[in-house]
């Protein structure tokens, strides 16, 4: 089967190959070819291109933000690893460490607090925070965490929040707060991740990371 | 239905501090999809940014105001308020206050109060 | 500072379309947009995101964007859109509003 199909493949080619040979002999004006016929093999050739360029116009329109296919939409993702931090902020740390990822320099990791992306398009973002609290030792808030942006020229936002109580348990219980959504980003954006109290999360292997994907 | 209201005093001394809260009922001021701004207008003029508040607390200011002007938020009001100290006449104007809509690609203000005279005279 | 330049005043006849300019350096890499304010009344968003229009707002009232220029055309101008028109944009965490512009429906 497979040769009957690489021979298939072969007289296609061949065919392309002629087609294509008379259409440069036609725009020499090669006397062996009729008017009628170079007229016939120009329109079709003509048909051809304009399909392929409509194609092409109606593919962009669909996906306005989309790069085209191959080496021009390269793979861009990111998978950052959490850091202790000294700072009394809110805005958590980040390090390329352990199991990390970042898959080239459409996405960087800024400041170890947030990921720029260079590219626009549809991003999904998501964190995991694990944190450590007690009822009694916290304030009667609950623990929030925050997914935010901050495009070039517009106001920093939140896209994402999620809250969980404090455990009873002592000296300190154990919870994980995930938070993961698809958001359009333009070129500059940037994104990190809040919570209410820095202090309280879980720095060990695996419990608190941050990353993104461009679909 | 999104209503905002403002409030306080409609004439000021010059040198004082020009105090205004804007009420917001039929929505929570603490939605993070929205900001809350102030837009000021003097008699006869165009529209002037003032500033922005987030319901996380998060503030931005008209550069040429940024010196002396502060917008706060209470929550527990659904409220937002805006002082301006050291007053001039030159801040006589109409104040308005304003909900920022957030949207993916462009910001806008989508719902306005009608807007208090605040005059500065002695 | 950023700066947003229009027309101080426009006039049209009723039926007859109508366009306001709205002009600032790289415009047309920002997203405008326009506000009505009728005299005495609060000021009410009629085209955003360049060309989108919010819901309650009449077909008639469009917005375009090119090069350094927006521009708000309202065709089959009414009476009723006789006010003031404002374009606004962002730059660097800014929020700026062009001077206005009074049109006049004779």
């Known amino acids: 089967h497979r040769r009957l199909d690489k021979i298939e493949d072969e007289r296609n080619l061949h065919e392309d190959f002629v087609f294509m040979k008379t259409i440069q002999r036609c725009n020499t004006g090669e006397r062996s070819l009729s008017l009628l016929n170079c007229e016939e093999i120009k329109s079709q050739f003509e048909g051809f291109v304009k399909d392929i360029m409509l194609n092409k116009e109606e593919t962009k329109k669909e996906n306005s933000f989309e790069m085209q296919k191959g080496d021009q939409n390269p793979q861009i993702a990111a998978h950052v690893i959490s850091e202790a931090s000294s700072k009394t902020t809110s805005v958590l740390q980040w390090a390329e460490k352990g199991y990390y990822t970042m898959s080239n320099n459409l996405v960087t990791l800024e400041n170890g607090k947030q990921l720029t992306v260079k590219r626009q398009g549809l991003y999904y973002i998501y964190a995991q925070v694990t944190f450590c609290s007690n009822r009694e030792a916290s304030s009667q808030a609950p623990f929030i965490a925050s997914l935010c942006l901050k495009s070039p020229g517009r106001f920093e936002r939140i896209l994402l929040r999620a809250a969980n109580t404090h455990s009873s348990a002592k000296p300190c219980g154990q919870q994980s707060i995930h938070l993961g959504g698809v958001f359009e980003l333009q070129p500059g954006a940037s994104v990190f991740v809040n919570v209410t109290d820095p202090s309280q999360v879980s720095h060990g292997t695996g419990f608190t990371s941050f990353g993104l994907l461009k679909l | 239905q999104v209503q905002l209201q403002e409030s306080g005093p409609g004439l000021v001394k010059p040198s004082e501090t020009l105090s205004l809260t804007c009420t917001v009922s039929?929505?929570?001021?603490?939605?993070?999809?929205?900001?809350w701004g102030w837009i000021r207008q003097p008699p006869g003029k165009g529209l002037d940014w003032v500033g922005c508040?987030?319901?996380?607390?998060?503030?931005y200011y008209n550069p040429s105001l940024k010196s002396r002007v502060t917008i706060s938020v209470d929550t527990s009001k659904n409220q937002f308020s805006l002082k301006l100290p050291s007053v001039t006449a030159a801040d006589t104007a109409v104040y308005y206050c304003?909900?920022?809509?957030?949207?993916?690609?462009?910001?806008?203000?989508?719902?306005w109060g009608q807007g208090t005279l605040v005059t500065v005279s002695s | 500072s950023y700066e947003l330049t229009q027309p101080p005043s426009v006039s049209v006849s009723p039926g007859q379309t109508v366009s306001i300019t709205c002009s600032g350096d790289?415009?047309?890499?920002?997203?405008a947009c326009w506000y009505q304010q009728k005299p005495g009344q609060s000021p009410v968003v009629v085209i955003y995101?360049?060309?989108k229009r919010p819901s309650g707002i009449p077909e008639r009232f469009s917005g375009s964007t090119s090069g350094n220029t927006a521009t708000l055309t309202i065709s089959g101008t009414q009476a009723m859109d006789e006010a003031d028109y404002y374009c606004?944009?962002?730059?660097?965490?800014?929020?700026?509003f062009g001077g206005g512009t009074k049109l006049t429906v004779l």
């Open positions: 304003a909900r920022l809509w957030l949207g993916t690609t462009t910001d806008y203000f989508d719902y």
């Open positions: 039929g929505d929570s001021i603490s939605s993070f999809i929205y900001y």
């Open positions: 508040i987030y319901s996380s607390g998060g503030t």
């Open positions: 790289k415009l047309g890499d920002k997203f």
């Open positions: 995101q360049d060309d």
């Open positions: 606004q944009a962002w730059d660097s965490n800014t929020v700026v």
